[in-house]
């Protein structure tokens, strides 16, 4: 069975084809090759000699037991080599020779027992080394690591490392890899020698499910003293053994680390006193809790110095009380409990993401809701009922506003967005909005992107609601049940580049409303019921138009519409997916491609 | 279409068939077997995925006695610092995991329950596997 040509001459997918040897019928120009799940078993020298351009090679689960000297010799352009799931028993000293451009080496679940004997010291370009799910017992980083000056990611998770000693990291003192991210999760740790991490700088350290008791966790974290880490991730996994006890003493040792960003990811334990618990983390710049349950929600009004707070997938009794002076970014998404939003006091806040919480807002939105006048980004998407009772007074700095898939009330009672002269992006898609007031978008003089798909209009008619949006470049009006539009609806949109009118109920096409759209490049009218043109004589669309989508409409392929059908043929160079433009009537022409029709109308008139 | 038996409990019998062409082997054990009136137990899965499990989600199509419920999407792996350790599993890496579950207080009517589980993962998204579970529910007298 031949390999699948994904990108001609470049990418080949040869997965699970029962190959016992490397295929010889692929082009020399192959750059990406997936040979996974083939019983190759043995790689001799110059195995890939006929792939001089290769950049990515996937050999996952190829039952490889032996890799000879120079097996990859000749692959001087290879940047990624994946060896996951091979039961390697014999790895020659020169197994990886010739890989002068290798940046990513994945040797997950390959029976690797030690880093010491892993022959990768010459791979100077290596950025990512993944040796997770192996049998490594010692965390001693061999001397050859001093050659790996570009290393950014080292994944040692799911190994057998129990202890870390001062001597294990000696090589990092000699050549501080300022950018190294280290993942040690799922190693059964019980001892970290104090001083082992002293004066070590890491970009990221991840320790999840490493400790089988609170005491071990406490002493190991104390053993991290002196570490300077940009981002520290602690926590557990839902499907692994969890700590039976967790209290404030667990994290006391963090006071002896220098941490820029902290994340606690999953804890099968109720957090009650977070002030004491995170006492050593009051001054990290970014603080994040993922998948934890928080009992006392008042604690978030303590004087933490955080600039970014992230609460994701957590459980709360009620919406937390948030009073944080220095906070600039708040991400509060996919949380449960506390369904009603309550006011927060965050005077420095610039970025607020409250999406996917099923929250309801009794009144939205003004400065008093968020306690800030600095807000630039607000995401309230995928929530419950949001009642618009104020038009963003005090929130004039907003540039990005997203309400999609929330239920907006009172949108047509006043000019909701009147204050938002700096707003660039607005998404009110699928918000149950019924446009019944022409001033709905008044004030949005800087708006560039407007997404309002899945809403409705009074009498299914699009009125002149965009008159102030002179900077608009993207407009989505799809799925709005529209049947008609004002001939001047788009007259002020001279910067508009993309207009989506798909999935509406238009029965005819008219070029007149688009005459002022001098920048229009994409017009999508797919999935309507267009049979013919509104007027006998269709003009040309703006000369800037490059893509016109008229697919999945109800074209009437009869003589009376001959001029319209001819006009469509004249637009051929603009049309996309022409094979999906088919006749709907008459029945004998149903399903025929419109462009291949040759309508000659010398029939009896 | 070969049917794979999972287990029997006092009020349910559970089996599955593959609903994809690939039919990559997957081993599923439930201990103790699910009782629909109330259940607590461990689900054990042994599987070698044909693609990374990053950003894994399930599409669930549930049918109750021929009545179709709306499609449900269950996101399992978001993509970073996920709840489950298998979210970091790579294509070709053995996934051998035990997940605890519990539910109570749901009354199910007698009949045949079908659940098609489409597992989607990776970037670009592609189907990982598709299994159709059949649960025959026979509520006992008590």
């Amino acid at each position: 069975e031949p390999c699948v040509e994904v990108v001609p001459n470049i990418t080949y997918q040869c997965m699970e084809l029962n190959f016992y040897k490397i295929p010889d019928n692929l082009p020399f120009s192959t750059k990406n090759l997936d040979l996974s799940f083939n019983p190759l078993r043995h790689l001799g020298s110059y195995s890939f000699f006929s792939f001089p351009e290769l950049q990515v090679l996937d050999l996952s689960r190829c039952e490889i037991q032996t890799i000879e000297d120079g097996a990859y010799q000749s692959l001087s352009h290879l940047s990624t080599l994946i060896l996951t799931g091979n039961p390697i028993q014999s790895l020659a000293l020169g197994a990886f020779s010739g890989l002068s451009s290798l940046q990513k080496l994945v040797a997950v679940e390959t029976n690797l027992a030690s880093l010491e004997n892993f022959p990768i010291g010459h791979l100077k370009t290596l950025k990512e080394l993944n040796v997770a799910h192996n049998l490594i017992q010692s965390f001693k980083l061999p001397e050859y690591f001093s050659n790996l000056t570009n290393l950014e990611h080292l994944d040692l998770s799911s190994n057998k490392i129990q202890s870390i000693y001062c001597t294990d990291l000696r090589v990092l003192h000699q050549m501080p890899l300022l950018n190294l991210s280290l993942d040690l999760s799922l190693n059964p740790m019980n001892f970290i020698q104090p001083g082992a991490f002293k004066e070590i700088r890491l970009h990221k350290l991840t320790l999840r499910n490493n400790f089988d008791s609170l005491n071990v966790m406490k002493t190991c974290i104390q053993g991290l003293a002196g570490l300077e880490v940009h981002r520290l991730v602690l926590g557990e996994f839902r499907n692994e053994g969890n700590l039976e006890k967790f209290d404030k003493s667990a994290l006391e040792g963090l006071c002896n680390l220098t941490i820029e960003e902290f994340r606690l990811a999953y804890l099968d334990y109720y957090l009650d006193d977070i002030i004491d618990l995170f006492n050593c983390l009051t001054n990290v710049s970014s603080f994040s809790l993922v998948s934890v349950t928080i009992e006392r929600v008042k604690d978030f009004s303590y004087n933490f110095g955080w600039q970014h707070l992230e609460l994701v997938n957590c459980k709360f009794g009620q919406f937390p009380t948030l009073k944080l002076k220095s906070l600039k970014r708040l991400t509060f998404t996919s949380n449960k409990g506390g369904n009603a939003f309550s006011e927060v006091d965050l005077p420095s806040l610039e970025f607020l993401d409250l999406s996917r919480n099923g929250l309801s807002f009794k009144g939205c939105c003004s400065q008093s809701d968020f306690g800030t006048t600095s807000l630039k980004y607000l995401d309230l998407s995928f929530n419950g009922v949001i009642t618009m009772s104020s038009n963003f007074l005090g929130l004039e700095q907003l540039e990005h506003l997203d309400f999609q898939h929330s239920n907006l009330k009172q949108m047509s009672e006043f000019s909701v967005f009147l204050s938002l002269r700096n707003l660039i992006y607005l998404d009110i898609s699928h918000t149950h909005t019924r446009v019944a007031f022409n001033g709905i978008f008044n004030g949005l003089s800087s708006l560039e992107v407007l997404k309002m798909a899945g809403n409705s209009f009074q009498e299914n008619f699009l009125p002149d609601i965009f008159t102030e949006l002179r900077n608009l470049t993207f407009l989505d009006l799809s799925q709005c049940q529209l049947e008609q539009l004002s001939p001047t609806a788009f007259n002020s949109l001279s910067s508009l580049q993309v207009l989506n009118m798909s999935h509406n109920n238009f029965f005819s096409l008219d070029t007149f409303p688009y005459k002022c759209l001098n920048s229009l490049q994409v017009l999508d009218y797919s999935l309507n019921h267009i049979m013919t043109s509104k007027k006998q004589e269709l003009q040309h669309f703006p000369s800037s138009l490059a893509f016109l989508n008229l697919t999945q409409n109800d074209f009437a392929c009869t003589c009376e519409h001959q001029s319209f059908l001819q006009w469509i043929k004249d637009q051929r160079q603009l049309l996309v997916e022409v094979e999906r433009m088919e006749c709907a009537t008459p029945s004998d022409k149903q399903g025929m491609p419109v462009l291949s029709l040759n309508i000659t109308c010398q029939m009896n008139k | 279409q070969k049917q794979y038996w999972v287990c029997n409990s006092s009020d349910a019998s559970i089996s599955y068939t593959y609903c994809d062409k690939m039919q990559y082997p997957i081993s599923i054990n439930v201990n103790p077997c699910i009782e629909l009136k109330r259940s607590k137990g461990l689900l054990h899965i042994f599987y070698i995925p044909r693609r990374d499990l990053k950003q894994l989600y399930f599409n669930l199509y549930i049918t109750v006695n021929t009545m179709n419920l709306p499609k449900r999407k269950e996101v399992i792996c978001r993509g970073s610092d996920d709840d489950y350790s298998f979210c970091r599993a790579l294509k070709g890496e053995t996934v051998n995991t035990t997940i605890s579950f519990s539910f109570k207080g749901i009354k199910f009517s007698k009949g045949k329950y079908k659940c098609v589980v489409e597992a989607i993962s990776g970037s670009p998204e592609e189907m990982l596997f598709c299994l159709e579970f059949v649960i025959l529910h026979q509520p006992n007298s008590n």
Partner: nanobody, 112 residues
Framework: EVQLVESGGGLVQAGESLRLSCVAS????????MGWWRQAPGKQGESVAI???????YYPDSVKGRFAISRDNAKNTVYLQMSSLKLEDTGVYYC??????RGQGTQVTVSS
């Protein structure tokens, strides 16, 4: 055991030609991917010619139009015809059978 023996190397002036030969034993080369690989002092090794069993050939831009690879299945021999040699063609040239190994190499020196 597969053995490859190269010959034909030597010292030549820039612009001149050389023909390298490689005799294989312990294997029939007719179905194998054959080629030549060179290693110049202090430089990255590189493939200079590859020949598949169906006759398709590959040359990097650096030698295209100057080098030609061929084989004689009856003699179990592969050849590399090198013309218009340049100073940068200097190095040890190894005969390769993909997945099987390489010979001991033959030195080619191009002088000005």
């Amino acid at each position: 055991e597969v053995q490859l023996v190269e010959s034909g190397g030597g010292l030549v002036q820039a612009g001149e030609s050389l023909r390298l030969s490689c005799v294989a034993s312990g294997i029939s080369i007719s179905t194998e991917i054959m080629g030549w690989w060179r290693q110049a002092p202090g430089k990255q090794g590189e493939s200079v010619a590859i020949l598949k069993s169906d006759g398709t050939t590959y040359y990097p831009d650096s030698v295209k139009g100057r080098f030609a690879i061929s084989r004689d299945n009856a003699k179990n021999t592969v050849y590399l015809q090198m013309s218009s040699l340049k100073l940068e063609d200097t190095g040890v040239y190894y005969c390769i059978i993909a997945g099987r190994g390489r010979g001991q190499g033959t030195q080619v020196t191009v002088s000005s």
